[in-house]
């Protein structure tokens, strides 16, 4: 399965301050927060599929080292 | 499941003002970016705007004299107001948020048909 | 204000064929080396339904035969075989910047 890209640092921008381990970049505001104020992918129960038009994203091909909950802290690279 | 639901009058007279909410369930507004999109019949997506986690907003400068979005954490909804609405306002309008770190709009709303007339 | 736009405005094909719709943006969406462009499916009455999210990673629950690619300002969208649920509108939307913007569509029919 593909995978999401690994990193918010790239061509067009110059790379985000580094978050600590419990903060997320937030695109929008430009800085890190909380990972827990972002909507970071959770977690499905194998099976689980959302009907439309609600259909999240799929956490096995976010960003992130691993599957499950895969949620980015973008900044802190891995 | 996070579901939204928008809710509010389907007909609004011109030059008042609409007022739609969408109440959201499965997750807190607390957490995450909420916004509201319009679509005009058979025609065009166009953002409005949103309300973030800490209560910040930002609207779509093409509407942001007109527009003001709220909301109520007590009861896990925000609301849209648009004010002056004329016919060019009649629109679906949808709420919606998108998931972190790519900001996809994952979950929507079903969407309501709000009419400007007399 | 970036502007998406898509082609061509409607597609005739019969089921089983290949779709390709395309969406160009006129500037890039790339960002921290992520392609921040997402495609939507809609029907009528109904609210549109992610697809595809960062220009290639298909949403929960989506097919196989939904694929994306592209980066910079230049991307498609591809139906490998059209299933007859498969007529829809389909919308291009870049969340690189607000404010977010869509394309205004490609119409896929029956032919």
């Known amino acids: 399965m593909r995978r999401g890209p690994r990193s918010l640092r790239g061509r067009d921008a110059p790379a985000p301050t580094p978050c600590v381990p419990a903060e997320c970049f937030d695109l929008l505001v430009r800085h890190c927060v909380a990972c827990g104020l972002l909507r970071t992918p959770r977690p499905k129960p194998a099976g689980a599929s959302s009907p439309a038009p609600r259909t999240a994203l799929q956490p096995q091909e976010s960003v992130g080292a691993g599957a499950g909950e895969a949620a980015l802290p973008l900044p802190g690279l891995l | 499941e996070v579901q939204l639901q928008e809710s509010g009058p389907g007909l609004v007279k011109p030059s008042q003002t609409l007022s739609l909410t969408c109440t959201v369930s499965?997750?807190?507004?607390?957490?995450?970016?909420w916004n509201w999109i319009r679509q005009h019949p058979g025609k065009c997506l166009e953002y409005i705007g949103y309300?973030?986690?800490?209560?910040?907003?930002y609207y779509n400068p093409s509407l942001k004299s007109r527009v003001t979005i709220s909301r109520d954490t007590s009861k896990n909804q925000y609301s849209l107001k648009l004010s002056s609405v004329t016919a060019a306002d009649t629109a679906v309008y949808y709420c919606?948020?998108?998931?972190?770190?790519?900001?996809?709009?994952?979950?929507w709303g079903q969407g309501t048909l709000v009419t400007v007339s007399s | 204000d970036i502007v998406l736009t898509q082609s061509p405005a409607t597609l005739s094909l019969s089921p089983g064929e290949r779709a390709t719709l395309s969406c160009r943006a006129s500037?890039?969406?790339?960002?921290?080396?992520?392609?921040?462009m997402n495609w939507f499916q809609q029907k009528p009455g109904q609210a549109p339904r992610l697809l595809i999210y960062?220009?290639?990673n298909r949403a929960t629950g989506i097919p196989a035969r939904f694929s994306g690619s592209g980066s910079g300002t230049d991307f498609t969208l591809t139906i490998s075989s059209l299933e007859p649920e498969d007529f829809a509108v389909y919308y291009c939307?870049?969340?690189?910047?607000?404010?977010?913007?869509f394309g205004c569509g490609t119409k896929v029919e029956i032919k």
């Open positions: 939307q870049q969340s690189k910047e607000v404010p977010w913007t």
């Open positions: 919606a948020s998108p998931n972190y770190p790519f900001y996809a709009m994952d979950y």
């Open positions: 960062a220009a290639s």
């Open positions: 309300i973030s986690y800490s209560g910040s907003t």
């Open positions: 500037e890039s969406v790339d960002n921290y080396g992520i392609s921040f």
């Open positions: 499965g997750d807190s507004i607390t957490s995450g970016y």
